[in-house]
Interface confidence: medium
């Protein structure tokens, strides 16, 4: 039997032959950031180069006596983890070690910047194939370790980090809070977040996915034979690390901005208990565990998207709130949420060339959450257009008048400090294809996308009676680009992402007196490419 | 994930510089913040990472480092340059005594000073 | 015991070619990176290109580009050099070595004379 | 290019005295600077990689220091065997090898 950490990342066609996915990631590069390693342990030996490179401080305590199986055993089973022969992700990928962290397993944002840049050196001189940089450590949030990162990410360097282990919100630490890393947080046998001590894995917004990482089997440093379990985000890390290198040598030509939707797409959803993270963590956290693609699978013909949140906005009454997309994603629609339902919505601007989303904090609101959704798309070309609030019965309406173009997203925005005094639209009408619809009071803000062979349609659901809760979801070869709630629903907190599914949320209906009048429902935009199906059927 | 906007400490000193003749001057107003680790016990004060401004030349990022030296030297510091960096972001590596930072911090180019902090295996 | 072993220096004509081999043995080849390097008669050290383990990416100095041609056979833990077009300038110990990343040259083989005369 | 002057081109000594031999680049290259040994007949041995770090197997006598652009190599006291060749050698973008033009330490 195989362990329980390859069986869960494994999918279920290759379980019939044991674990013998191909032998991946043989066109990739590993660099592993962290302590010296064994390099003739016999899980990685002839895999592994030591580099020349080494920056760690003095360890701490005058007493400290130096013991080679100790300085090495984290970084050793790490690299057993991502590459090991019998125990390894990716048996076929290479690694390259730099040590940035002493025997204690200490280290300093300086001395891995140097890393960092010693890296970035080595591709300049000598380049190689797609590189994945294996960040396995964490710190206080630091602005200049996350600068690196973006600059080594926008490179073309692939870079994987541990979420941490202090049961805490990964933003606050770095490199785990770039948004150009891929950050791992751990998850168990039995799909809960990994315990450690009083303590345990990170969570939040800041984490892209879960991995497995407790009792994790690799490489010992107690000899050249030996193994050992060990937990913690490192070793989810590890594995996400060696997923990439598999994904990047199946499909070389992949950009961070596609493996890290691959990686979303191809994880098992919404398996974690989220009771385990604080409750306002929970809508934040991805309900993600990494698993490897399919063997035969090329997913370049899929419309992929994924959710961003923001950070939070903070209480003031004119505070907002900014979700940005990845480099090479386009922003197909902008929602907003707030716990106390106090926001003045959202809308998408344009900064620094790039389309962001911004929610508004209202009065008396506790703080905002800007939500983008972030999609893949060839040759797309995307506009917003706006209606001002129509003070009309009918409600303020827009669409996609441009020839070509359709509609991936709405949003609604409003000066107004509460909408619920507002009266609602006496009539809402039905959904159509190219236009969004909204209260009267707000301004609409359509999003209308161009791309070779894209196609959408609007989906609602409507419930008669208040919900706190209101889901509608695409079918299978569409992909939900916009989640937005029907006007009218004047008690909503608002509407978000989780993979495929659009979910509106509402205030509690049993503490706002509301009536079957103010019924909630969820509009989702599905959207596909014809264009991208199409090659992918000349391909097979 | 998270933008420039963490739970750090942030001192921004809006500060020009007090040398005359300095052709390279930044402009009036012109802001370079300081930026520390919340984690107390994670600093390490003493050492900094001194950030230039993106488009700023890689000879830029010796020449800046050898100012502050020698205006240090001036006050009767010492400092060291630890490393130059050139293939990520233009800057430097400095051990010194906080007291200059303010020094630091006027000096053309410069875009932000982040002390030294810990970091850990996860 | 890290070793290597060059061979197939000797007398060459001008104009002719020849193809150095160095045989590693010690550790596994296919994971290390190699390089060559050159030494004329009472001169210093010249270096002339490598080949990267990852994959298999060779690099040169702009002096030898066309000249010279480094590949490598991992099922016989062998490195080999190709010479074209050899002068009397050419005439030189020549030296395969392994290098880390961090581009220090930890190990050398004992070097082979090539002799370019008529 | 870099290029990697050393300096002396000769340093005459007797055994037991200090030798320092010193390597400039002439652009900014960190730390990333090794130095070699060479004695007649023989390939070059690594004695220090990242301008400090000792070779594996390479006595203490043998010390590097400096970064950026100025590195020395110290042999604190000479013993008979180290009379030889050494060069600097340094890698950067283009081209990524380097070696300096050598210092000869030889007996006074």
């Known amino acids: 039997s195989i362990p329980w950490n390859l069986e869960r990342i494994t999918p279920a066609r290759y379980r019939a032959d044991e674990y013998q996915p191909p032998k991946g990631g043989s066109l990739v590069e590993v660099y592993l950031l962290d302590t010296s390693i064994q390099s003739d342990h016999r899980e990685i030996e002839g895999r592994v180069m030591v580099t020349d490179f080494e920056s760690v401080p003095e360890e701490d305590g005058t007493r400290f006596h130096r013991q080679a199986s100790k300085c090495d055993s984290h970084g050793t089973h790490l690299a057993g983890v991502v590459s090991g022969r019998d125990a390894g992700v990716a048996k076929g990928a290479g690694l390259r070690s730099l040590r940035v962290l002493n025997c204690q397993g200490k280290g300093t944002v300086s001395g891995t910047l140097i890393g960092l840049e010693f890296i970035r050196k080595s591709q300049l001189v000598q380049p190689v194939g797609p590189l994945v940089v294996l960040l396995p450590l964490a710190g206080g949030y630091s602005r200049v370790f996350n600068a690196a990162c973006q600059r080594l990410a926008r490179a073309g360097v692939v870079l994987v980090t541990a979420a941490g282990n202090f049961r805490d919100d990964a933003c606050l630490y770095s490199p785990a809070s770039a948004p150009e890393v891929i950050t791992v947080g751990a998850t168990n046998a039995q799909d809960q977040p990994v315990t450690l001590g009083t303590l345990g894995t990170n969570f939040g917004r800041c984490v892209d996915l879960f991995a497995p990482g407790e009792d994790i089997i690799g490489a010992s440093s107690d000899c050249s034979t030996c193994f050992v379990s060990r937990s913690g985000t490192s070793q989810a890390a590890a594995h996400v690390a060696g997923i990439a290198a598999m994904m990047l040598s199946a499909e070389p030509e992949l950009t961070l901005a596609e493996l890290r939707q691959r990686l979303i797409h191809f994880s098992a959803k919404d398996v974690i208990n989220e009771a385990w993270f604080p409750e306002d963590q929970r809508v934040l956290t991805p309900n993600l565990v990494a698993a490897l693609p399919p063997s035969t699978h090329r997913a370049g013909w899929q419309l992929f998207c994924r959710t961003v949140w923001s950070a939070h906005s903070g209480p003031t009454r004119m505070a907002t709130a900014v979700a940005r997309c990845a480099q090479d994603e386009e922003l197909l629609s902008c929602s907003s949420f707030s716990r106390s339902g106090k926001r003045r919505g959202e809308r998408i601007e344009a900064q620094g060339g790039k389309r962001v989303c911004r929610a508004h904090n209202a009065f008396g609101g506790e703080g905002v959450y800007a939500i983008a959704r972030c999609c893949l798309l060839p040759q797309v070309n995307c506009s917003v257009h706006t209606a001002p609030p129509a003070g009309a019965s009918m409600g303020t309406r827009v669409h996609c008048h441009q020839q070509g173009h359709v509609l991936t997203g709405c949003s609604s925005h409003w000066e107004v400090e509460d909408l619920g005094t507002h009266k609602p639209p006496v009539l809402r009408p039905r959904g159509q294809p190219n236009q969004c619809v909204g209260h009267r009071e707000a301004s609409i803000h359509a999003s209308c996308c161009h791309a070779p062979g894209l196609e959408c349609k609007v989906k609602e659901h409507g419930i008669p009676a208040p919900q706190e809760q209101v889901i509608v979801a695409c079918e299978d070869g569409w992909t939900l680009t916009g989640c937005s709630p029907l006007p009218g629903t004047s008690h909503v907190l608002g509407a978000y992402a989780v993979d495929n599914t659009c979910v509106v949320r509402s205030r509690d209906v049993s503490t706002t007196g509301s009536t079957s009048k103010e019924a909630v429902a969820a509009v989702a935009i599905c959207c596909r490419s014809r264009h991208l199906v199409q090659a992918s059927q000349e391909l097979q | 994930q998270e933008d420039e906007d963490g739970d750090y400490e942030e001192l921004v000193l809006a500060l020009r510089s007090e040398e005359d003749g300095l052709a390279d001057a930044p402009e009036h107003g012109a802001t370079a913040t300081f930026h520390r680790c919340a984690k107390d016990p994670w600093r390490l004060p003493g050492t900094y990472v001194v950030v230039l401004k993106e488009e700023t030349h890689r000879s830029q990022s010796e020449r800046t480092a050898r100012r502050l030296q020698a205006q240090a030297a001036r006050r009767g510091y010492l400092t060291k340059i630890l490393h130059v960096f050139h293939h990520l972001l233009p800057g430097f590596l400095v051990k010194m005594s906080g007291d200059l930072l303010e020094l630091a911090l006027k000096l053309p180019h410069v875009d932000y000073i982040e002390e030294d902090s810990s970091v850990f295996a996860q | 015991q890290v070793q290597l072993l060059e061979s197939g220096g000797g007398l060459v004509q001008p104009g002719g070619s020849l193809r150095l081999s160095c045989k590693a043995s010690?550790?596994?080849?296919?994971?290390?990176?190699f390089t060559w390097v050159r030494q004329a008669p009472g001169k210093g050290l010249e270096w002339i290109g490598w080949?990267?383990?990852?994959?298999?990416?060779?690099r040169y100095n702009e002096k030898f580009k066309g000249k010279a041609t480094i590949s490598r056979d991992n099922s016989k833990n062998t490195l080999y050099l190709q010479m074209n077009s050899l002068r009397a300038e050419d005439t030189a110990v020549y030296y395969c070595?392994?290098?880390?990343?961090?581009?220090?040259?930890?190990?050398w083989g004992q070097g082979t004379l090539v002799t370019v005369s008529s | 290019e870099i290029v990697l002057t050393q300096s002396p081109a000769t340093l005459s000594l007797s055994p037991g005295e200090r030798a320092t031999i010193t390597c400039r680049a002439s652009?900014?290259?960190?730390?990333?600077l090794n130095w070699y040994q060479q004695k007649p007949g023989q390939a070059p041995r690594l004695l220090i990689y990242?301008?400090?770090n000792r070779a594996t197997g390479i006595p203490a006598r043998f010390s590097g220091s400096g970064s950026g652009t100025d590195f020395t190599l110290t042999i604190s006291s000479l013993e008979p065997e180290d009379f030889a060749v050494y060069y600097c050698?340094?890698?950067?973008?283009?081209?990524?090898?380097?070696f300096g033009g050598g210092t000869k330490v030889e007996i006074k």
């Open positions: 990242d301008a400090s």
């Open positions: 050698q340094v890698w950067d973008s283009s081209p990524p090898v380097v």
């Open positions: 010690g550790y596994t080849f296919s994971r290390q990176g």
């Open positions: 070595a392994r290098y880390r990343v961090g581009y220090s040259l930890d190990y």
């Open positions: 080949i990267d383990p990852g994959n298999g990416g060779t």
């Open positions: 652009q900014y290259v960190g730390s990333y």
